[in-house]
Protein backbone atom coordinates (compact mmCIF):
# COMPACT_ATOMS: atom_id res chain seq x y z
CA UNK A 1 0.00 0.00 0.00
CA UNK A 2 2.80 2.39 0.93
CA UNK A 3 4.59 1.53 -2.30
CA UNK A 4 1.40 2.24 -4.28
CA UNK A 5 0.94 5.58 -2.50
CA UNK A 6 4.54 6.52 -3.17
CA UNK A 7 4.10 5.76 -6.86
CA UNK A 8 0.84 7.72 -6.83
CA UNK A 9 2.59 10.70 -5.25
CA UNK A 10 5.38 10.52 -7.80
CA UNK A 11 2.90 10.27 -10.63
CA UNK A 12 0.97 13.26 -9.26
CA UNK A 13 4.18 15.23 -8.87
CA UNK A 14 5.19 14.65 -12.47
CA UNK A 15 1.64 15.43 -13.64
CA UNK A 16 1.77 18.73 -11.76
CA UNK A 17 5.15 19.55 -13.26
CA UNK A 18 3.87 18.84 -16.76
CA UNK A 19 0.62 20.73 -16.35
CA UNK A 20 0.28 24.35 -17.43
CA UNK A 21 -2.07 25.87 -14.85
CA UNK A 22 -1.66 29.44 -16.12
CA UNK A 23 -4.86 29.40 -18.20
CA UNK A 24 -6.77 28.49 -15.01
CA UNK A 25 -5.16 31.36 -13.13
CA UNK A 26 -5.89 33.78 -15.98
CA UNK A 27 -9.49 32.60 -16.25
CA UNK A 28 -10.14 32.92 -12.51
CA UNK A 29 -8.53 36.35 -12.14
CA UNK A 30 -10.48 37.68 -15.12
CA UNK A 31 -13.67 36.19 -13.71
CA UNK A 32 -13.42 37.72 -10.25
CA UNK A 33 -12.38 41.09 -11.67
CA UNK A 34 -15.25 41.01 -14.14
CA UNK A 35 -17.69 40.23 -11.33
CA UNK A 36 -16.38 43.14 -9.30
CA UNK A 37 -16.55 45.46 -12.32
CA UNK A 38 -20.13 44.47 -13.02
CA UNK A 39 -21.15 45.36 -9.48
CA UNK A 40 -19.32 48.60 -10.22
CA UNK A 41 -18.45 49.08 -6.57
CA UNK A 42 -16.65 47.84 -3.53
CA UNK A 43 -19.44 46.10 -1.56
CA UNK A 44 -17.85 47.21 1.69
CA UNK A 45 -18.06 50.92 0.97
CA UNK A 46 -21.29 51.70 -0.87
CA UNK A 47 -20.37 55.34 -1.41
CA UNK A 48 -17.22 54.52 -3.35
CA UNK A 49 -16.88 52.86 -6.74
CA UNK A 50 -13.31 51.60 -6.82
CA UNK A 51 -13.32 50.57 -10.45
CA UNK A 52 -15.12 51.38 -13.64
CA UNK A 53 -15.79 48.52 -16.05
CA UNK A 54 -13.05 47.67 -18.51
CA UNK A 55 -14.11 46.93 -22.10
CA UNK A 56 -11.59 44.07 -22.20
CA UNK A 57 -13.02 42.36 -19.13
CA UNK A 58 -16.60 43.05 -20.15
CA UNK A 59 -16.08 41.17 -23.40
CA UNK A 60 -15.15 37.95 -21.65
CA UNK A 61 -13.94 36.25 -24.85
CA UNK A 62 -10.39 35.93 -23.56
CA UNK A 63 -11.68 34.36 -20.39
CA UNK A 64 -13.70 31.61 -22.12
CA UNK A 65 -10.63 30.76 -24.19
CA UNK A 66 -8.62 30.50 -20.97
CA UNK A 67 -11.37 28.36 -19.43
CA UNK A 68 -11.27 25.90 -22.30
CA UNK A 69 -7.49 25.55 -22.04
CA UNK A 70 -7.79 25.33 -18.26
CA UNK A 71 -10.30 22.48 -18.46
CA UNK A 72 -8.03 20.59 -20.84
CA UNK A 73 -5.24 20.82 -18.26
CA UNK A 74 -7.46 19.85 -15.30
CA UNK A 75 -8.77 16.88 -17.28
CA UNK A 76 -5.37 15.25 -16.70
CA UNK A 77 -6.19 15.04 -12.96
CA UNK A 78 -9.70 13.59 -13.40
CA UNK A 79 -8.76 10.13 -12.15
CA UNK A 80 -6.80 11.30 -9.14
CA UNK A 81 -8.82 13.39 -6.71
CA UNK A 82 -5.90 14.04 -4.41
CA UNK A 83 -3.81 15.23 -7.32
CA UNK A 84 -6.68 17.42 -8.53
CA UNK A 85 -6.72 19.00 -5.07
CA UNK A 86 -2.96 19.62 -5.27
CA UNK A 87 -3.44 21.33 -8.63
CA UNK A 88 -6.09 23.61 -7.12
CA UNK A 89 -3.81 24.31 -4.16
CA UNK A 90 -1.01 25.24 -6.54
CA UNK A 91 -3.29 27.70 -8.37
CA UNK A 92 -4.26 29.26 -5.03
CA UNK A 93 -0.62 29.49 -3.99
CA UNK A 94 0.40 31.09 -7.29
CA UNK A 95 -2.24 33.83 -7.03
CA UNK A 96 -2.45 34.42 -3.28
CA UNK A 97 -0.13 37.42 -3.31
CA UNK A 98 -2.28 39.08 -5.99
CA UNK A 99 -5.28 39.11 -3.64
CA UNK A 100 -4.86 41.84 -1.05
CA UNK A 101 -8.41 41.79 0.26
CA UNK A 102 -10.41 39.24 2.24
CA UNK A 103 -13.37 39.49 -0.11
CA UNK A 104 -11.17 38.99 -3.21
CA UNK A 105 -9.49 35.99 -1.62
CA UNK A 106 -12.80 34.38 -0.64
CA UNK A 107 -14.26 34.96 -4.09
CA UNK A 108 -11.19 33.47 -5.73
CA UNK A 109 -11.44 30.38 -3.49
CA UNK A 110 -15.14 30.03 -4.28
CA UNK A 111 -14.50 30.15 -8.03
CA UNK A 112 -11.52 27.81 -7.67
CA UNK A 113 -13.62 25.21 -5.83
CA UNK A 114 -16.23 25.40 -8.60
CA UNK A 115 -13.65 25.07 -11.36
CA UNK A 116 -13.63 21.25 -11.75
CA UNK A 117 -17.44 21.27 -11.86
CA UNK A 118 -17.41 24.02 -14.50
CA UNK A 119 -15.15 21.77 -16.55
CA UNK A 120 -17.52 18.83 -16.13
CA UNK A 121 -15.08 17.08 -13.81
CA UNK A 122 -15.49 15.69 -10.32
CA UNK A 123 -14.47 18.12 -7.61
CA UNK A 124 -12.26 16.79 -4.80
CA UNK A 125 -14.35 16.15 -1.69
CA UNK A 126 -11.95 17.65 0.82
CA UNK A 127 -9.44 20.18 -0.39
CA UNK A 128 -7.90 22.78 1.90
CA UNK A 129 -7.25 25.99 -0.05
CA UNK A 130 -6.14 28.08 2.92
CA UNK A 131 -3.11 30.32 2.47
CA UNK A 132 -1.64 33.01 4.69
CA UNK A 133 -3.98 35.98 4.49
CA UNK A 134 -2.93 38.57 1.95
CA UNK A 135 -0.58 36.16 0.24
CA UNK A 136 3.18 36.39 0.02
CA UNK A 137 5.30 38.28 -2.43
CA UNK A 138 7.44 35.76 -4.24
CA UNK A 139 10.42 36.71 -6.37
Amino acid sequence: RQQWELQGDRRCQSQLERANLRPCEQHLMQKIQRDEDSYGRDPYSPSQDPYSPSPYDRRGAGSSQHQERCCNELNEFENNQRCMCEALQQIMENQSDRLQGRQQEQQFKRELRNLPQQCGLRAPQRCDLEVESGGRDRY
Partner: antibody
Framework: QVQLVESGGGVVQPGRSLRLSCAAS????????MHWVRRSPDKGLEWVAA????????YYADSVKGRFTISRDSSKNTLFLQMDSLRVEDTAVYYC???????????WGQGTLVTVSS | DIVMTQSPLSLPVTPGEPASISCRSS???????????LDWYLQKPGQSPQLLIY???KRASGVPDRFSGSGSGTDFTLKISRVEAEDVGVYYC????????FGQGTKVEIK
Amino acid sequence: QVQLVESGGGVVQPGRSLRLSCAASGIAFNDYTMHWVRRSPDKGLEWVAAISYGGTNKYYADSVKGRFTISRDSSKNTLFLQMDSLRVEDTAVYYCARDSGYRSLLHWGQGTLVTVSS
Amino acid sequence: DIVMTQSPLSLPVTPGEPASISCRSSQSLVHRNGYNYLDWYLQKPGQSPQLLIYMASKRASGVPDRFSGSGSGTDFTLKISRVEAEDVGVYYCMQALQTWTFGQGTKVEIK
Protein backbone atom coordinates in the same frame (compact mmCIF):
# COMPACT_ATOMS: atom_id res chain seq x y z
CA GLN B 1 -17.60 58.26 3.64
CA VAL B 2 -14.09 56.84 3.52
CA GLN B 3 -11.64 58.53 5.87
CA LEU B 4 -8.03 57.80 6.69
CA VAL B 5 -6.49 60.20 9.20
CA GLU B 6 -2.76 60.09 9.95
CA SER B 7 -1.22 61.50 13.13
CA GLY B 8 2.01 61.35 15.10
CA GLY B 9 4.25 63.35 12.79
CA GLY B 10 6.61 66.01 14.07
CA VAL B 11 10.21 67.16 14.34
CA VAL B 12 12.70 64.60 15.65
CA GLN B 13 16.47 64.27 15.85
CA PRO B 14 18.41 61.69 13.82
CA GLY B 15 18.63 58.34 15.60
CA ARG B 16 15.41 58.92 17.55
CA SER B 17 12.03 57.20 17.14
CA LEU B 18 8.52 58.21 16.16
CA ARG B 19 5.25 56.30 15.91
CA LEU B 20 2.69 57.22 13.27
CA SER B 21 -0.99 56.23 13.47
CA CYS B 22 -3.68 56.08 10.84
CA ALA B 23 -7.30 55.94 12.00
CA ALA B 24 -9.71 54.48 9.47
CA SER B 25 -13.45 54.98 9.21
CA GLY B 26 -16.06 54.33 6.54
CA ILE B 27 -14.06 51.47 5.03
CA ALA B 28 -13.71 47.77 5.69
CA PHE B 29 -10.34 48.33 7.38
CA ASN B 30 -9.93 44.74 8.55
CA ASP B 31 -10.53 43.29 5.10
CA TYR B 32 -7.72 44.91 3.12
CA THR B 33 -3.97 45.26 2.98
CA MET B 34 -2.87 48.68 4.26
CA HIS B 35 0.14 50.70 3.12
CA TRP B 36 2.41 53.53 4.20
CA VAL B 37 3.77 55.76 1.41
CA ARG B 38 5.90 58.87 1.82
CA ARG B 39 6.53 61.94 -0.31
CA SER B 40 9.68 64.02 -0.11
CA PRO B 41 10.57 67.00 -2.33
CA ASP B 42 13.68 65.31 -3.74
CA LYS B 43 12.40 61.73 -4.12
CA GLY B 44 8.70 62.14 -4.92
CA LEU B 45 6.43 59.28 -3.82
CA GLU B 46 8.11 56.29 -2.20
CA TRP B 47 6.30 53.18 -1.04
CA VAL B 48 7.41 52.38 2.53
CA ALA B 49 5.58 49.36 3.93
CA ALA B 50 2.42 47.25 3.77
CA ILE B 51 0.61 44.79 6.01
CA SER B 52 -1.87 42.13 4.91
CA TYR B 53 -5.44 42.23 6.23
CA GLY B 54 -4.80 39.50 8.76
CA GLY B 55 -1.54 41.10 9.84
CA THR B 56 0.40 37.92 9.00
CA ASN B 57 2.42 39.35 6.13
CA LYS B 58 4.49 42.52 6.30
CA TYR B 59 6.40 44.03 3.41
CA TYR B 60 9.05 46.75 3.58
CA ALA B 61 11.04 48.92 1.19
CA ASP B 62 14.78 48.20 1.38
CA SER B 63 15.42 51.76 2.57
CA VAL B 64 13.48 51.17 5.83
CA LYS B 65 13.95 47.44 6.42
CA GLY B 66 15.13 46.72 9.95
CA ARG B 67 14.28 50.26 11.14
CA PHE B 68 10.53 50.60 10.55
CA THR B 69 7.78 48.27 11.77
CA ILE B 70 4.24 48.25 10.41
CA SER B 71 1.37 46.91 12.52
CA ARG B 72 -2.39 47.16 12.82
CA ASP B 73 -4.98 47.05 15.59
CA SER B 74 -8.14 45.51 14.14
CA SER B 75 -10.25 46.32 17.18
CA LYS B 76 -9.43 50.03 16.85
CA ASN B 77 -9.35 50.22 13.02
CA THR B 78 -5.89 51.72 13.28
CA LEU B 79 -2.67 51.28 11.32
CA PHE B 80 0.74 52.06 12.84
CA LEU B 81 4.25 52.75 11.64
CA GLN B 82 6.96 52.52 14.29
CA MET B 83 10.00 54.40 12.97
CA ASP B 84 13.30 53.79 14.78
CA SER B 85 16.85 54.98 14.04
CA LEU B 86 15.45 57.85 12.00
CA ARG B 87 17.66 59.48 9.38
CA VAL B 88 17.58 62.92 7.76
CA GLU B 89 16.50 61.22 4.49
CA ASP B 90 13.34 59.92 6.21
CA THR B 91 12.00 63.50 6.23
CA ALA B 92 8.75 63.40 4.27
CA VAL B 93 4.97 63.59 4.36
CA TYR B 94 3.74 60.10 5.33
CA TYR B 95 0.43 58.83 3.91
CA CYS B 96 -1.49 55.72 4.80
CA ALA B 97 -3.43 54.09 1.98
CA ARG B 98 -5.85 51.19 1.64
CA ASP B 99 -5.34 48.57 -1.02
CA SER B 100 -8.06 47.99 -3.60
CA GLY B 101 -7.74 44.25 -3.05
CA TYR B 102 -5.77 43.90 -6.28
CA ARG B 103 -2.55 45.69 -5.25
CA SER B 104 -3.59 49.24 -6.24
CA LEU B 105 -3.62 52.05 -3.66
CA LEU B 106 -7.24 53.10 -3.72
CA HIS B 107 -7.93 55.27 -0.66
CA TRP B 108 -5.41 57.75 0.76
CA GLY B 109 -5.18 59.81 3.94
CA GLN B 110 -4.23 63.50 3.98
CA GLY B 111 -0.70 62.80 5.29
CA THR B 112 1.39 63.73 8.32
CA LEU B 113 4.75 65.52 8.12
CA VAL B 114 7.85 63.96 9.67
CA THR B 115 10.97 66.14 9.87
CA VAL B 116 14.25 64.55 10.93
CA SER B 117 16.73 67.26 11.73
CA SER B 118 19.53 67.94 14.20
CA ASP C 1 14.27 45.30 -7.21
CA ILE C 2 12.19 46.68 -10.06
CA VAL C 3 13.22 50.19 -11.10
CA MET C 4 10.62 52.50 -12.67
CA THR C 5 11.76 55.27 -15.02
CA GLN C 6 9.42 58.04 -16.19
CA SER C 7 9.86 60.55 -18.98
CA PRO C 8 9.69 63.44 -19.33
CA LEU C 9 10.23 64.62 -15.76
CA SER C 10 8.63 67.95 -16.60
CA LEU C 11 5.84 68.51 -19.12
CA PRO C 12 4.52 71.99 -19.98
CA VAL C 13 1.07 71.61 -21.55
CA THR C 14 -1.49 73.72 -23.36
CA PRO C 15 -5.15 73.32 -22.32
CA GLY C 16 -7.11 71.50 -25.03
CA GLU C 17 -4.00 69.81 -26.40
CA PRO C 18 -3.08 66.14 -25.87
CA ALA C 19 -0.27 65.04 -23.56
CA SER C 20 1.47 61.76 -22.85
CA ILE C 21 3.83 60.41 -20.22
CA SER C 22 6.02 57.36 -20.62
CA CYS C 23 6.96 54.82 -17.95
CA ARG C 24 9.50 52.04 -18.32
CA SER C 25 10.19 49.21 -15.87
CA SER C 26 13.48 47.36 -15.46
CA GLN C 27 11.66 44.04 -15.94
CA SER C 28 8.34 42.84 -17.31
CA LEU C 29 5.31 43.65 -15.17
CA VAL C 30 3.17 40.87 -16.63
CA HIS C 31 2.14 38.38 -13.98
CA ARG C 32 1.49 34.73 -14.82
CA ASN C 33 -2.24 35.56 -14.56
CA GLY C 34 -1.91 37.75 -17.66
CA TYR C 35 -2.33 41.12 -15.98
CA ASN C 36 0.18 43.98 -16.10
CA TYR C 37 0.70 45.27 -12.55
CA LEU C 38 1.18 48.93 -13.42
CA ASP C 39 -0.81 51.86 -11.96
CA TRP C 40 -0.88 55.60 -12.61
CA TYR C 41 -1.44 58.14 -9.81
CA LEU C 42 -1.89 61.90 -9.84
CA GLN C 43 -0.95 64.16 -6.97
CA LYS C 44 -2.51 67.57 -7.44
CA PRO C 45 -0.94 70.55 -5.62
CA GLY C 46 -1.84 70.46 -1.91
CA GLN C 47 -3.72 67.16 -2.22
CA SER C 48 -3.13 63.47 -1.53
CA PRO C 49 -2.35 61.18 -4.46
CA GLN C 50 -5.27 59.59 -6.31
CA LEU C 51 -5.50 56.43 -8.38
CA LEU C 52 -6.13 57.13 -12.08
CA ILE C 53 -5.36 53.87 -13.90
CA TYR C 54 -4.81 50.36 -12.55
CA MET C 55 -3.54 47.22 -14.27
CA ALA C 56 -2.07 49.34 -17.06
CA SER C 57 -5.32 50.25 -18.79
CA LYS C 58 -8.31 50.16 -16.43
CA ARG C 59 -9.66 53.54 -15.43
CA ALA C 60 -10.53 53.98 -11.74
CA SER C 61 -14.05 55.23 -11.14
CA GLY C 62 -14.67 58.93 -11.24
CA VAL C 63 -11.66 59.40 -13.51
CA PRO C 64 -12.58 61.36 -16.69
CA ASP C 65 -12.35 59.35 -19.90
CA ARG C 66 -9.79 61.80 -21.32
CA PHE C 67 -7.28 59.75 -19.28
CA SER C 68 -6.18 56.44 -20.77
CA GLY C 69 -3.42 53.95 -20.04
CA SER C 70 -1.75 51.55 -22.43
CA GLY C 71 1.27 49.30 -22.76
CA SER C 72 2.45 45.89 -21.67
CA GLY C 73 5.58 44.24 -20.38
CA THR C 74 8.09 47.01 -19.71
CA ASP C 75 6.72 50.01 -21.66
CA PHE C 76 3.65 51.95 -20.57
CA THR C 77 2.00 55.24 -21.50
CA LEU C 78 -0.50 57.54 -19.85
CA LYS C 79 -2.37 59.75 -22.31
CA ILE C 80 -4.55 62.78 -21.69
CA SER C 81 -6.58 63.37 -24.84
CA ARG C 82 -7.33 67.05 -24.08
CA VAL C 83 -5.56 68.61 -21.11
CA GLU C 84 -7.64 70.70 -18.73
CA ALA C 85 -6.34 73.22 -16.19
CA GLU C 86 -7.32 70.89 -13.33
CA ASP C 87 -4.99 68.18 -14.64
CA VAL C 88 -1.85 69.91 -13.34
CA GLY C 89 0.18 68.09 -10.73
CA VAL C 90 2.72 65.30 -10.49
CA TYR C 91 1.93 62.01 -12.25
CA TYR C 92 3.50 58.78 -11.00
CA CYS C 93 3.57 55.29 -12.42
CA MET C 94 3.83 52.46 -9.88
CA GLN C 95 4.63 48.78 -10.30
CA ALA C 96 2.82 46.30 -8.07
CA LEU C 97 4.30 43.07 -9.39
CA GLN C 98 6.92 42.68 -6.64
CA THR C 99 6.03 44.67 -3.55
CA TRP C 100 5.47 48.25 -4.83
CA THR C 101 7.71 50.88 -6.48
CA PHE C 102 6.96 54.35 -7.85
CA GLY C 103 8.57 56.17 -10.75
CA GLN C 104 10.26 59.54 -10.10
CA GLY C 105 7.17 61.48 -11.16
CA THR C 106 6.34 63.80 -14.05
CA LYS C 107 5.39 67.38 -13.23
CA VAL C 108 2.65 68.61 -15.53
CA GLU C 109 2.10 72.38 -15.62
CA ILE C 110 0.29 74.81 -17.87
CA LYS C 111 2.54 76.65 -20.35
